[in-house]
C-alpha cells in the first residue's frame, strides 16, 4: 500500500491521543535505553510503511502484535485516514485470524515495540532544524 495520500495530521493526532499511550503501557517496566535503533524511516509515507510492517507482519520471536491495543488503534487510524487502505488489508486480516495464538510478551516483541516507538517519534517530528 502507498501511504502517500494519507491524512498525516489526523494520524499524528490519533498517535498523540491514544496510540502513544498504549505503546508506553506495553513497554512498561522496560528501560527506554534498553534497545538500540535498528530501523528508521525517511519521510511520513516511509514511516507508515515501516510501522505497518512491524505492527502487523509476524517476525521470528514475535509471532503477532496485531491483537494488541496499540495495533488495533493503528489499524483503525490507517483505515480511516488512508484512502483505500482497508481494502488492501482484508486478505491479511483473514489470514491473521487463522493464525491466532495465545498472547506472550517476549523480549523480541518488546524490542519490536521499542522500534515502533522510534518510528512513530520520527513520523511526528518531520521538520528537523532547517539547514
Amino acid at each position: 500500500y502507498d501511504f502517500t495520500n494519507c491524512d498525516f495530521e489526523k494520524i499524528k493526532a490519533a498517535y498523540l491521543s491514544t496510540i502513544s499511550k498504549d505503546l508506553i503501557t506495553y513497554m512498561s517496566g522496560t528501560k527506554s535505553t534498553e534497545f538500540n535503533n535498528t530501523v528508521s524511516c525517511s519521510n511520513r509515507p516511509h514511516c507508515l510503511t515501516e510501522i505497518q510492517s512491524l505492527t502487523f507482519n509476524p517476525t521470528a520471536g514475535c509471532a503477532s502484535l496485531a491483537k494488541e491495543m496499540f495495533a488495533m488503534k493503528t489499524k483503525a487510524a490507517l483505515a480511516i485516514w488512508c484512502p483505500g487502505y482497508s481494502e488492501t488489508q482484508i486478505n491479511a486480516t483473514q489470514a491473521m485470524k487463522k493464525r491466532r495464538k495465545r498472547k506472550v510478551t517476549t523480549n523480541k516483541c518488546l524490542e519490536q515495540v521499542s522500534q515502533l516507538q522510534g518510528l512513530w517519534r520520527r513520523f511526528n517530528r518531520p521538520l528537523l532544524k532547517q539547514q
Epitope: 535503533n37 535498528t38 530501523v39 528508521s40 524511516c41 525517511s42 519521510n43 516511509h46 515501516e50 520520527r122 518531520p126 528537523l128 532544524k129 532547517q130 539547514q131
Partner: antibody, heavy 122, light 108 residues
C-alpha cells in the same frame, strides 16, 4: 549486534580501480542512508559519498566526483564503493557508516565500520 | 562550500572541564554532531543534533550550538577521554557532509 564490516582494501597502482564493500547486519539496512568516509594517514576525517536509503539518489565530495560510484544492494544488506582512476591522494582508511535521513537531510552517523586500508602507490 | 573550524588542540587537567569549539557561518541553524576517535579506532558518535547523547555515552559529554559556534563540553575529564574530536554537519545547500578539521584533546 549492529555491525558494519568493510572489505576490499589493498595496494593498487595509480590509475587503476578498486571496489570496496560494506556488509551490514543487526539492523534494517534498507531504512538507513549510508556513507563512505575516509581518513588519510595522520589526517582528519573526509566525507566521500552518501546514498539514500532507497538507493535512488547519491551525493559525492568534489574530490571524488566522476571517479567514485556508491551503490547498495538492499536485498543483500551491502554497500559498495567503486573507485576508478585512483590517485596517490586517495590513500586512506575507508569507513562505511549508517545515517538516518529525513527527506533529503542526513542525520548523524551512529554506527561505523572498522575501516579498510587503501594504498595507491606505484 | 561550508567550512567548519576547530582548534587543533585542547588540554584539560583530570577532573576539570574541557570545551571544544566548532565554528561555522550561522552554524546555529544547523544540526551539529560530534565524534570521538581514539588512535587506530573508528570514530564513535558522542553527541548528535547539537546536544543529544546516544544511550551508551556518559552524561559528562554535552553539546550546545548557537550563532556561529557549536561547543562540545566534557566535564570531569578523564585519561580515557584523550582522543581526536570532530564536529560534523549536513550542508543541505550543496548536499554534502562537512567535517571540522578535528581537535586533539589531551588530559594532562
Amino acid at each position: 549486534q549492529m555491525q558494519l564490516v568493510e572489505s576490499g582494501g589493498g595496494v593498487v597502482q595509480p590509475g587503476r580501480s578498486l571496489r570496496l564493500s560494506c556488509a551490514a547486519s543487526g539492523f534494517t539496512f534498507r531504512t538507513y542512508g549510508m556513507h563512505w568516509v575516509r581518513q588519510a594517514p595522520g589526517k582528519g576525517l573526509e566525507w566521500v559519498a552518501v546514498i539514500w536509503y532507497s538507493g535512488t539518489t547519491t551525493h559525492y565530495a568534489d574530490s571524488v566526483k566522476g571517479r567514485f560510484t556508491i551503490t547498495r544492494d538492499n536485498s543483500k544488506n551491502t554497500l559498495n564503493l567503486q573507485m576508478n582512476s585512483l590517485r596517490a591522494e586517495d590513500t586512506a582508511v575507508y569507513y562505511c557508516s549508517r545515517s538516518p535521513q529525513w527527506e533529503d537531510i542526513f542525520e548523524s552517523m551512529d554506527i561505523w565500520g572498522q575501516g579498510t586500508m587503501v594504498t595507491v602507490s606505484s | 562550500s561550508y567550512v567548519l573550524t576547530q582548534p587543533p588542540s585542547v588540554s584539560v587537567a583530570p577532573g576539570q572541564t574541557a570545551r571544544i569549539t566548532c565554528g561555522g557561518n550561522n552554524i546555529g541553524s544547523k544540526n551539529v554532531h560530534w565524534y570521538q576517535q581514539k588512535p587506530g579506532q573508528a570514530p564513535v558518535l558522542v553527541v548528535y543534533d547539537d546536544s543529544d547523547r546516544p544511550s551508551w555515552i556518559p552524561e559528562r559529554f554535552s553539546g550546545s550550538n548557537s550563532g556561529n559556534t557549536a561547543t562540545l563540553t566534557i566535564s570531569r575529564g578523564e585519561a580515557g577521554d584523550e582522543a581526536d574530536y570532530y564536529c560534523q554537519v549536513w550542508d543541505s545547500s550543496d548536499f554534502l557532509v562537512v567535517f571540522g578539521g578535528g581537535t586533539k584533546l589531551t588530559v594532562l
